[in-house]
Interface confidence: medium
């Protein structure tokens, strides 16, 4: 018996250690969203095990203060759905000391009435505006730069109408550096991670998107006022195209934004001559007056594989040839204006009818097939470059029905260190739970144990490879105290045990020869410490009769003092 798998929050994620009693589920939200509810649930034992709390949700907060803002995102409440009426949201962004901020407009969609977005160059509602949706018809594609370390963002909505609102991306950057670039639906690689002058950045688009406007490669120029020499490009899902890759994606125009009305788009997909194509239609949400047609060949006269209108759930089509033509015609009269309305089609080259479709390479990783032919039983393993980790299943198997057992994985940048683990006989103080770059873990040994190694570990970024701890986890070893040095037996007496070194905590016993009496402690102890030392001075043996006493006194005077009167263990 176990707990049900907890629901993944929209705009967030959940990681589960176990679904059995005692197991836990941890929730976190995507950038720009905040967790509402318990961050951590525990599976409780019962006839039917259950979670100790309701699953939390990720909500876009109406305003907030973001101190030490490095990179992130602020989104309007409800995003990417519509915001509600009568909102007044204020966000204050504050960059780390000595840094400035750059804002990218990821999306701004306000109802055409009295809804308003103002961005101010300062830390309060009186600061001068650098963007006001009332004043500006178009978004500045190059974004906004703060003159100091603050931006103040105001969103106000009235009592009528609503829209998707806004998503803004912020990046802090140092003096003498450019800000971190951003391309929606794409990616970039940079020659240096902090973007000083001279850095070049190369952009690429996600599958299905095409680079438009701007430049593929930009450079950080001008040491006096560092800036990018060109605007960042945009990645857009375009209407029509010719594709000759062995695998890829075809998206409805403008995806995931709504497609326009009255469009007639044609895509041609061409693979190697003797191959065929598997079309995996993952999303199909079009209007009843819109038509998506697949032709089994390289023009519109070919046999129709399928023609679809309206919404439809996930399905697959197979061509009989090496070409497929996809035509999309949207109704000129009505438009479906919702977010993620349209279609997402993945295609794969299929060698012949006895093999699984060819699998593509993945960005920042590579694949290793267990055998060259992708016949039933073939296993393809995906691995990522150092500094990236596999998201999804790294092992895909060609099944009986000649489909792959799992979806294609991806390689995601590792932005945190692994948990360095607990150290026996210690407790630890953690600066942040997921060990992001800059996080520290401090180990404090229990009493009676001493630390061997570094007590504080810091998670450092590396240009090549995953972030790494500054040191190994230390050890807490049982305190090994120095022993006490042996004391000489008193004259006319004896000691036991007769050792040169006595461990901390040990006791020695003294006794006198017949006719002598002990003056001082009969037992003394080696007291643990740094250094360890004897609890008392050593005793002496005195003659029992007066004659003997005087004889011994004269001898005492004639003798040098016993060296054993030095009590510490260092000598």
């Amino acid at each position: 018996l176990s707990c049900h798998f907890p629901r993944r929050p929209a705009y967030g994620d959940v990681t589960v250690t176990s679904l059995h009693p005692g197991g836990s589920a941890r929730f976190h939200c995507a950038t720009g969203y905040q967790l509402k509810g318990a961050r951590h649930l525990t599976c409780l034992n019962a006839t039917q095990p259950f979670w100790d709390s309701k699953e939390p949700v990720c909500i876009a907060a109406c305003g907030g203060v973001i101190r030490n803002a490095t990179t992130g995102r602020i989104v309007s409440p409800g995003f990417p759905g519509n915001y509600s009426n009568n909102l007044t949201c204020h966000w204050l962004l504050e960059a780390p000391e000595g840094q400035r901020l750059h804002l990218h407009f990821e999306k701004v969609s306000l109802a055409e009435d009295d809804d308003r977005l103002i961005i101010r160059n300062g830390d309060n509602v009186e600061a001068p505006p650098v963007y006001d949706s009332y004043e500006v018809e178009y978004l500045p594609i190059e974004g906004l730069l703060s003159s100091g370390k603050h931006f103040f963002v105001e969103l106000s909505t009235d009592s009528s109408g609503a829209a998707a609102g806004m998503a803004l991306r912020y990046e802090a950057f140092q003096q003498g550096h450019c800000y971190e670039p951003f391309v929606k639906y794409g990616n970039f690689s940079s020659s240096t991670p902090t973007y000083p002058v001279g850095t070049t950045v190369e952009f690429s688009c996600d599958p299905g998107y095409t680079l438009e406007q701007g430049s593929i490669i930009i450079e950080c120029v001008d040491p006096h006022d560092p800036q990018w020499n060109e605007t960042e490009p945009a990645c857009r899902a375009v209407c029509s195209g010719e594709i000759t890759d062995s695998a890829g994606v075809v998206l409805s125009p403008n995806w995931p934004e709504p497609y326009g009305r009255g469009q007639d788009c044609i895509w041609g997909v061409h693979v190697e001559e003797d191959k065929r194509i598997m079309l995996d239609i993952r999303v199909l949400r079009i209007g009843p007056g819109d038509v998506l047609t697949f032709y089994d060949g390289d023009d519109l006269t070919a046999r129709v594989l399928g023609q679809y209108s309206g919404p439809r759930s996930h399905f697959k089509l197979f061509t009989s040839m090496a070409d497929v033509t996809i035509q999309f015609q949207s109704d000129p009269g009505t438009s479906v204006l919702g977010y993620q309305q349209g279609f997402v089609i993945h295609f794969f080259e299929v060698p012949r009818n006895d093999t699984c479709p060819e699998l593509p390479e993945i960005p920042n990783g590579w694949k290793s097939p267990s055998q060259p032919e992708l016949v039933h039983g073939t296993v393809v393993t995906y691995q990522c470059y150092p500094g990236y980790q596999v998201v999804g299943s790294s092992v895909l198997m060609c099944q009986w029905d000649l489909t792959w057992s799992e979806d294609l994985p991806s390689c995601q940048r590792v932005t945190s260190c692994h948990d360095p683990g607990d150290v026996e006989h210690s407790r630890r103080l953690i600066s942040s739970p997921k060990f992001p770059v800059g996080a520290t873990v401090q180990y404090i040994c229990d009493q009676g144990f001493v630390l061997m190694g570094s007590s504080i570990l810091t998670c450092h970024d590396r240009q090549a490879g995953s972030p790494k701890w500054s040191d190994r986890a230390p050890k807490c070893l049982l305190e090994q105290l120095k022993p006490c040095h042996g004391l000489s037996a008193p004259e006319n007496g004896a000691r036991s045990p007769e050792k040169q070194l006595h461990p901390a905590g040990a006791t020695i016993h003294f006794s006198c020869a017949p006719g002598y009496v002990l003056k001082g402690q009969a037992s003394i102890k080696c007291v643990p410490g740094h250094p360890s030392h004897w609890s008392d001075p050593p005793p002496i043996c005195r003659a029992a009769s007066l004659d003997g006493f005087y004889n011994s006194r004269s001898l005492d005077v004639a003798k040098a003092p016993a060296a054993s009167s030095t009590l510490d263990a260092a000598h």
């Epitope: 390479e361 993945i362 990783g365 097939p369 055998q371 060259p372 032919e373 016949v375």
Partner: antibody, heavy 117, light 107 residues
């Protein structure tokens, strides 16, 4: 037209290493695989391994692991094979060939490597 | 490793004749066999893939057949430019392996 010009012949001493190149043109270099094949004088063909130009992923014939190392430089559309600890057994013509994972549709002219003291 | 045995090692034929090359695999490999031609001092050239699939630009006199363990390459009317070594190659499992080749010479 697809071309795979290869680097010039190499005369090297036993124990040394050599790096031979294969520059691709006329097609999308990052969307294919470059294989390397060995042919000893008067003998047959032996597959060494391939590199996926796009990802840098490699698959080797176990026999050549530790002997051959395959790399690719996408900006220059060039594939390389580094051969180490050379002996007379490594004297051969080394071909690069473009293909899918399974067969080779275009071949380079070959690079002759002679190992001699 | 899969062993490919080509026979005969040498074939002597006259122009205009038909000729067949044999390639036998040490285990069943479906149709995962590909044929190459290598002229003297030249590079190999792909003739046939997957046992019987033709390659654009290769004369139609070249054809292939077979599946499982036995495969055949045929030239239906030999021309002098066909004098070369012929190799089969399997792609059923790693490592990819070639046969030792058959040398075609003029009678």
């Amino acid at each position: 037209q697809v071309h795979l010009p290869q680097s010039r012949p190499e005369l090297v001493k036993p124990g040394a290493s050599v790096k031979i190149s294969c520059k691709a043109s006329g097609y999308g270099f990052t969307r294919s695989y470059i294989h390397w094949v060995k042919q000893r004088p008067g003998q047959g063909l032996e597959w060494i391994g391939y590199i996926s130009s796009g990802s840098g992923g490699t698959t080797y014939n176990q026999k050549f692991k530790g002997k051959a190392s395959l790399t690719a430089d996408n900006p220059s559309s060039t594939a390389y094979m580094h051969l180490s600890s050379l002996t007379s057994e490594d004297s051969a013509i080394y071909f690069c060939a473009r293909g899918g994972v399974r067969y080779f549709d275009v071949w380079g002219a070959g690079t002759t490597v002679t190992v001699s003291s | 490793d899969i062993l490919l045995t080509q026979s005969p090692a040498i074939l002597s034929v006259s122009p205009g004749e038909g000729v067949s090359f044999s390639c036998r695999a040490s285990q069943s490999i479906g149709t995962s066999i590909h044929w190459y031609q290598q002229r003297t001092n030249g590079s190999p050239r792909l003739l046939i893939k997957y046992a019987s699939e033709s390659i654009s630009g290769i004369p139609s006199r070249f054809s292939g057949s077979g599946s499982g363990t036995d495969f055949t390459l045929r030239i239906n009317s030999l021309e002098s430019e066909d004098i070369a070594d012929y190799y089969c190659q399997q792609s059923n499992s790693w490592p990819l392996t070639f046969g030792a080749g058959t040398k075609l010479e003029l009678k």
